[in-house]
Interface confidence: low
């Protein structure tokens, strides 16, 4: 006896759904996809906005930092002397860190040609050098922990830093000297930061004076000069002192530098 099963296949669920349900499902899918795309785009926007806010905050911090240095240099006593010294040493360290020789791969070199040539970093930090010359202009050398970023700033005749690009520069000098009141003249020890622009007379940018110490044989004192100045191409800056023989040339005592802002 042969039994035959007339097995009807079940109707597909999809075809059984009413049209209103299909439209609802379609709209729901479109809504969810739109929601996902919208969320993704909003996340990207938010990320970029936060980056911009962060940049602005950093810029504000940099401005505050520069203002603090300026306050220290103008002698405003809103900060303790210790803070000022700390800030100055941090700033000098920061300048040196910027100029640390990073190993550049060929790829970075080509990038530097494209981007760096338009606005290259210009910075210099030179170290004092004892001189047999009787001139009041201090002598400097590229030695020890010095910085010379590129040929857009050069040390000329060991006495002046010369820039090839116009712009705002932070120029600083630290002069440490050892003097005694009895052995020195009555006049104080004066350090001056001077500018010589092409076709113009020399001019004093900054000046500081210290009275002589009563310590024997002499007392060490330091003068720090620093400020932001507009320099023209070919402008040179140098440091003058009343008595170069009293300047201390030990490691880290006397230095001179600039940084293009």
């Amino acid at each position: 006896m042969i039994e035959t099963y007339n097995q009807t296949s079940p109707r597909s669920a999809a075809t059984g759904l009413p049209i209103s349900m299909k439209i609802f499902m379609y709209l729901l899918t479109v809504f969810l996809i739109t929601q996902m795309i919208g969320s993704a785009l909003f996340a990207v926007y938010l990320h970029r906005r936060l980056d911009k806010i962060e940049d602005e905050r950093n810029l504000h911090e940099d401005f505050v930092f520069m203002k603090t240095i300026q306050r220290c240099n103008t002698g405003e006593r809103s900060l303790s002397l210790l803070n000022c010294e700390e800030i100055k040493s941090q700033f000098e360290g920061f300048v040196k860190d910027i100029m640390l020789n990073k190993e550049e791969t060929k790829k970075e070199n080509s990038f530097e040609m494209q981007k760096g040539d338009q606005n290259p970093q210009i910075a210099a930090h030179v170290i004092s050098e004892a001189s047999s010359k009787t001139t009041s202009v201090l002598q400097w050398a590229e030695k020890g922990y010095y910085t010379m970023s590129n040929n857009l700033v050069t040390l000329e005749n060991g006495k002046q830093l010369t820039v090839k690009r116009q712009g705002l520069y932070y120029i600083y000098a630290q002069v440490t000297f050892c003097s005694n009141r009895e052995a020195s003249s009555q006049a104080p020890f004066i350090a001056s930061l001077c500018l010589k622009s092409p076709g113009r007379f020399e001019r004093i940018l900054l000046r500081a004076a210290n009275t002589h110490s009563s310590a024997k044989p002499c007392g060490q004192q330091s003068i720090h000069l620093g400020g932001v100045f507009e320099l023209q191409p070919g402008a040179s800056v140098f440091v003058n002192v009343t008595d170069p023989s009293q300047v201390s040339h030990g490691t880290g005592f006397t230095s001179f530098g600039l940084l293009k802002l």
Epitope: E142, Y145, M148, L155
Partner: nanobody
Framework: EVQLLESGGGLVQPGGSLRLSCAAS????????MGWVRQAPGKGLEWVST????????YYADSVKGRFTISRDNSKNTLYLQMNSLRAEDTAVYYC???????????WGQGTLVTVSS
């Protein structure tokens, strides 16, 4: 990759001269201070000379002052050491080195042997 390749070493009689060369690649040569360091047989490393990135300043160890001259050609990425009035005590392996700061060296060559003997 930073590479420093010395050449020009050899045997020379006392009072003679030699010129060492160092071909540099893999970094921005005209931004780096360069130097020469030597190591005599059985002795430690001795700094010989340094030249600043643009060649504006040169520095020498007292033992070689007046006899050795360091120079560089930035267009060829090459460092040189001209050695005159050589003495037996100048016998050493001479290394060309890239300076990070002052007399801190971060990359060295393989070295070239200079023998001063009669």
């Amino acid at each position: 990759e930073v590479q420093l390749l010395e050449s020009g070493g050899g045997l020379v009689q006392p009072g003679g001269s030699l010129r060492l060369s160092c071909a540099a690649s893999g970094f921005t040569f005209n931004k780096a201070s360069m130097g020469w360091v030597r190591q005599a047989p059985g002795k430690g490393l001795e700094w010989v000379s340094t030249i600043t990135p643009h060649g504006s300043s040169t520095y020498y160890a007292d033992s070689v002052k007046g006899r050795f001259t360091i120079s560089r050609d930035n267009s060829k990425n090459t460092l040189y050491l001209q050695m005159n009035s050589l003495r037996a005590e100048d016998t050493a392996v001479y290394y060309c080195a890239k300076q990070r700061w002052g007399v801190e060296f971060d990359y060295w060559g393989q070295g070239t042997l200079v023998t001063v003997s009669s």
